[in-house]
């Protein structure tokens, strides 16, 4: 009968042949006179047996990742006669692998927003990398992942590749982040080879914001013969946030003579003095009142920073008109 | 008796381009490897290029790289090397030889007597 | 590419005399090293594979002997055909490189 061990060559071999194995017949006393013959996709090719002694060889170099398995025919042949010492017979070789494929990630670019401040331990997205090699083939094709960039604010599980929040951020400081992330094989050890890919994060806005009047003193003036309703300057607040986040409400806090009015444009986000009574020069030729402005959307969750509305100071003059 | 018989050499200009061929007999010709290897005037044997049997796969020193080409014709057992843009530092013997069995798979167990190649202007 | 180193260039021995030739690898190439002898206006000819495996036809006065870098080529008891230029050639990389000769001449 046939005699042969399972048949192995390792990928990337890069001698000129490699010695796999022997194929040979129990009846050969090796005197040579038998011949070994080998058939199938890949014989002469990139295999080859010695006639004589039935040890194959590999001849050429092998991808794993291109093919892993080879089937090939054995036959043996009595020299003498031309007949066959046994029947024709179906090998395997299979090809080892090697850790020649480096970890790719294959679902780049990366993006993901998540919102400013979110909690320590926030999930924000998970990178995958690939690796062509065997994953039953030791370590070749576990990966690690690690961070590169993005300390102290991201964190990275090392084998699932989820990045999460590992410090708060706040998007008025900084809107986006690009974080860069490792992925080894060999679980790390020596002889590991790594691919990177780069995280382009990005912060949503929260209503972590009041608005802040920019003048602490406005100074308008109102003509004596100015109608009711009409507009006599505008006061303004900037708000940090965007958005809806950043849409705010002026209204009066302190007007003991109840003449003036503030309504908001909301297109400009001003808040617009308004003449409620009409004013005489003679009779009042100057005003104070206190405006204040809050967001117009505050959730619940984020009031604490919003406790107390900024206020403002609004000086109004009147002026004199010749009276017939 | 295996015998292997160079032809096809001759004077040739820098640039030009030239075809050596190999017979080959006495043996299966597409179960082995095949080499050239040349040998310019007075100095050593520099390895040319090897086609394994049945010419699935072809070899080449760098030097000759890009501006050679081996192949093989089974149905007639020949052996080829197709040289081009021929430089004066190609000026040679070239010799054929072939390749062995089982782990001398790509060694060069039989030569041919070889055949001159001369680049000149 | 696997440089092969031959000593002595010229080796001048007598009839009779030992030969010993020298091939070193500049790094391991297992048993995979031939001898080829020749001679004036001759093709080479093969004489040793696999490090000490002799070719078809070979004397047994001749041997090889060696592995990974370092290898040698004995010719017991030196006739007259074997004054000629013998070369090493390793076969177990890509590129195949020739050592660069030795020469055994009468002396």
């Known amino acids: 009968g046939w005699v042969w061990n399972q048949f192995f060559v390792p990928e990337e071999m890069n001698t000129t042949s490699h010695h796999i194995g022997q194929l040979r017949s129990d009846l050969d006393n090796g005197n040579n006179s038998f011949q070994y013959k080998l058939l199938g996709a890949g014989a002469g090719s990139t295999f080859i047996i010695d006639e004589r002694t039935g040890d194959i060889y590999a001849i050429q170099k092998l991808d794993r990742e291109e093919r892993s398995l080879y089937i090939l025919r054995a036959q043996v042949i009595d020299i003498a006669t031309g007949r066959a010492v046994e029947p024709e017979s179906e090998f395997v070789i299979k090809v080892s692998d090697i850790n020649d494929n480096e970890p790719k990630f294959l679902d780049e670019p990366y993006e993901a927003i998540v919102p400013e401040m979110s909690p320590e331990g926030t999930l924000v997205i998970q990178v995958t990398a690939s690796d062509a090699d065997d994953p039953s083939s030791g370590n070749n094709a576990r990966l690690l992942y690690s961070l590169l960039q993005g300390q102290p604010y991201f964190s990275v599980e090392p084998t699932t590749g989820v990045i999460r929040i590992s410090s708060k951020m706040d998007r008025e400081l900084q809107d986006e982040y690009w974080v860069i992330i490792q992925a080894k094989d060999m679980i790390g050890q020596p002889g590991a080879l790594s691919g990177t890919t780069s995280v382009l994060i990005k912060l949503s806005d929260v209503n972590d914001n009041k608005p802040i009047f920019k003048e602490s003193l406005y100074r308008l003036t109102v003509s004596e013969s100015a109608p009711t309703g009409t507009s006599i300057g505008t006061i303004m607040a900037y708000d940090n946030d965007i958005g809806e986040n950043a849409e705010m409400d002026y209204s009066i806090e302190e007007d003991d003579s109840q003449t003036f009015d503030i309504i908001t444009n909301h297109e400009t986000q001003e808040g617009i003095v308004i003449l409620k009574k009409k004013v005489d020069f003679e009779h009042q030729n100057h005003y104070g009142i206190r405006a204040k402005v809050k967001n117009h959307h505050v959730p619940e969750q984020l009031m604490k920073y919003h406790t107390e509305a900024s206020t403002t100071f609004i000086k109004i003059q009147v002026e004199d008109v010749d009276e017939p | 008796e295996v015998q292997l018989l160079e032809s096809g050499g001759g004077l040739v200009q820098p640039g030009g381009s030239l075809r050596l061929s190999c017979a080959a007999s006495?043996?299966?010709?597409?179960?082995?490897?095949m080499n050239w290897v040349r040998q310019a005037p007075g100095k050593g044997l520099e390895w040319v290029s090897t086609?394994?049997?049945?010419?699935?796969?072809?070899y080449y020193a760098d030097s000759v790289k890009g501006r050679f080409t081996i192949s093989s014709d089974n149905s007639k057992s020949t052996l080829y090397l197709q040289m081009n843009s021929l430089r004066a530092e190609d000026t040679a013997v070239y010799y054929c030889?072939?390749?062995?069995?089982?782990?001398?798979?790509?060694?060069?167990?039989?030569w041919g007597q070889g055949t001159t190649v001369t680049v000149s202007s | 590419e696997i440089v092969m180193t031959q000593s002595p260039v010229t080796l001048s021995l007598s009839l009779g005399e030992r030969a010993t030739l020298s091939c070193r690898a500049s790094?391991?190439?297992?048993?995979?090293l031939a001898w080829f002898q020749q001679k004036p206006g001759q093709a080479p000819r093969l004489l040793i594979y696999?490090?000490?495996t002799r070719a078809t036809g070979i004397p047994a006065r001749v041997s090889g002997s060696g592995s990974g870098t370092e290898f040698t080529l004995t010719i017991s008891s030196l006739q007259s055909e074997d004054f000629a230029v013998y070369y090493c050639?390793?076969?177990?990389?890509?590129?195949?490189?020739f050592g660069g000769g030795t020469k055994v001449e009468i002396k």
């Open positions: 006495g043996f299966t010709f597409s179960s082995y490897a």
């Open positions: 696999g490090a000490f």
């Open positions: 030889a072939k390749g062995g069995m089982g782990g001398y798979y790509y060694g060069m167990d039989v």
């Open positions: 086609i394994s049997g049945g010419g699935a796969n072809t």
């Open positions: 790094q391991s190439i297992s048993s995979n």
């Open positions: 050639q390793q076969y177990n990389y890509w590129p195949l490189t």
